[in-house]
Amino acid sequence: IWELKKDVYVVELDWYPDAPGEMVVLTCDTPEEDGITWTLDQSSEVLGSGKTLTIQVKEFGDAGQYTCHKGGEVLSHSLLLLHKKEDGIWSTDILKDQKEPKNKTFLRCEAKNYSGRFTCWWLTTISTDLTFSVKSSRGSSDPQGVTCGAATLSAERVRGDNKEYEYSVECQEDSACPAAEESLPIEVMVDAVHKLKYENYTSSFFIRDIIKPDPPKNLQLKPLKNSRQVEVSWEYPDTWSTPHSYFSLTFCVQVQGKSKREKKDRVFTDKTSATVICRKNASISVRAQDRYYSSSWSEWASVPCS
Amino acid sequence: RNLPVATPDPGMFPCLHHSQNLLRAVSNMLQKARQTLEFYPCTSEEIDHEDITKDKTSTVEACLPLELTKNESCLNSRETSFITNGSCLASRKTSFMMALCLSSIYEDLKMYQVEFKTMNAKLLMDPKRQIFLDQNMLAVIDELMQALNFNSETVPQKSSLEEPDFYKTKIKLCILLHAFRIRAVTIDRVMSYLNAS
């Protein structure tokens, strides 16, 4: 058993049929010595008396808010949560496996630039009685500070018969130099509590590996005389690291109709303009990627050919 | 140590081309190592990230773009010099700051070159003959060092009398390649910045 936060404790249980469970001793936070009784949750049934209460925790029925009282007055609470371990593996029931970029990916993180700011998100099908808390650091043995905000519900989607909820959090490394060469990864730890179930999820990454620029901005077309060709120009996204001559991007320019199966024109360039062939009912799209370290491409920025 | 000598070059900033070739060569070699050594811990997640130039050179700080010298977090390790122009540029006004940056890059290359050559000598003794360093990568390191145009004491190649542990050597190769790729990215950014200056 360990303390998650004040008056909230996590009991780690090996989860299998007829498991013996874990013996837990609760102590009432009071100077009083006599006349103390214990109850669980909203029940008025007295579980025991005295300053300490010893319980055998085996299942979720044994978890919950234990309260010690004296003469009708509440003295203190201890909330017990369960963390299940099945076949040596901690449970991951609360969050959905996103399977990208690999199996068992519960947390996904992205950064728009090298400033040390990044966003992580996760998915769940659970809609109520759910709380998250996020901690982060650079390195684990001698951790350097990363400050994370509160996790918020950022999107809801319908997936077949189920509703899916996306939560996200923004974090900022306390002292980040955009030009630095990372040797210690960022560690992100998410504590998830659903009712009386506790789970924790972690992700470890270098900012350089989670870079995904915003789409290029200000796409403009200029038809070329006596030609099917069009000159398309754009600018670096505002959120990208500066100076741009140091943090350079490379671009992919594509002309395609509405269907992905349709024919297309595609060209890669390090410049902020390119010449392509425009077709009726097609769109010109441009996306960006770090020129020197190939992490993710940005989403497409598009304008219609016409 | 001699400061870099600026040789007039009417064409493109010459080091940019070499640094692009360097990054490409290192990336290819790293990819080859990851494929060939698939049963060794050779991915970014599996290896320890070591920097053989740590406390010996200060490329990131010495080559920091002017715009980032206002960022306190970029200045925490030492008095930072910033880059303005340099020997690879066709200019005779090579600043001291610039020389420091390019000299630091040169020292990085020299250190990695020695490490890679030593390692290759060991790998050539491996009866499995599983992996060797790409000669193209070694040649590209050499070309960039020549383009940087420094005179520097030659570092003797390390020789080891004991029987090499090939497993450890291959893991060290992965560690070196990952670190060198990151440094090659920095070098490319620096050269691109200089080219635009």
Partner: antibody, heavy 118, light 107 residues
């Protein structure tokens, strides 16, 4: 399976014209760009131009501009390349090639030898 | 027009040995470069597109690398069926242009 079948070899006199055909099978004809290139005996490849069979849009290499015409007939899934004012240096194998991507070629015809000789 | 220069023009190789063909563009073309193989009396066949992207059905011993002006086609271990002429082609701008070709011959 996508295939491009070209018409047979031709022998032409200098100053005349030649029209080579390229019939496509497998896949929808208008879903692909169609290109023509040529290869003189023992020489490299030379791109001549492309057509979008969907709308008849064409683009030609400046070297052939005014001498080459590329057309397409959607009803027969056939593209044509006509080269006029032939000279001996036009002796070459002419290839059609297609792709959903405009700028490179993933399926090629077998080639048509055009010999220009007096 | 962008001029593509291949080297060497002839490459004698022992079967089973690796081979590398270089292609240089007269100006920067990013990764807009493609490689073809041509055997005598046959049409060219696409091997690699956009400098390093492999084509399904093409053996994995063929790989491409490069960007900007310098590109390489590598055959890790030459098989008898690989003796042919190889062409690079740029798609950065029209007119599309090819290298002169590199003939890989048996040593």
């Amino acid at each position: 399976q996508v295939q491009l079948v070209q018409s047979g070899a031709e022998v032409k006199k200098p100053g005349s014209s030649v029209k080579v055909s390229c019939k496509a099978s497998g896949g929808t004809f208008s879903d692909y760009y169609l290109h023509w290139q040529r290869q003189a005996p023992g020489q490299g490849l030379e791109w001549m131009g492309w057509i979008d069979p969907e709308n008849g849009d064409t683009e030609y290499a400046p070297k052939f501009q005014g001498r080459v015409t590329i057309t397409a007939d959607e009803s027969t899934s056939t593209a044509y390349m006509e080269l006029s004012s032939l000279r001996s240096e036009d002796t070459a194998v002419y290839y059609c090639a297609r792709n959903k991507e405009l700028r490179y070629f993933d399926v090629w015809g077998q080639g048509t030898l055009v010999t220009v000789s007096s | 027009d962008i001029v593509m220069t291949q080297s060497p023009l002839s490459l004698p190789v022992t079967p089973g040995e690796p081979a590398s063909i270089s292609c240089r563009a007269s100006q920067s073309i990013s990764i807009n470069l493609h490689w073809y193989q041509q055997k005598p009396g046959q049409a060219p066949r696409l091997l690699i597109y956009f400098a390093s992207q492999s084509i399904s059905g093409v053996p994995s011993r063929f790989s491409g690398s490069g960007s900007g002006t310098d590109f390489t086609l590598t055959i890790s271990s030459l098989q008898p069926e690989d003796f042919a002429t190889y062409y690079c082609q740029q798609s950065n701008s029209f007119p599309l242009t090819f290298g002169q070709g590199t003939k890989v011959e048996i040593k």
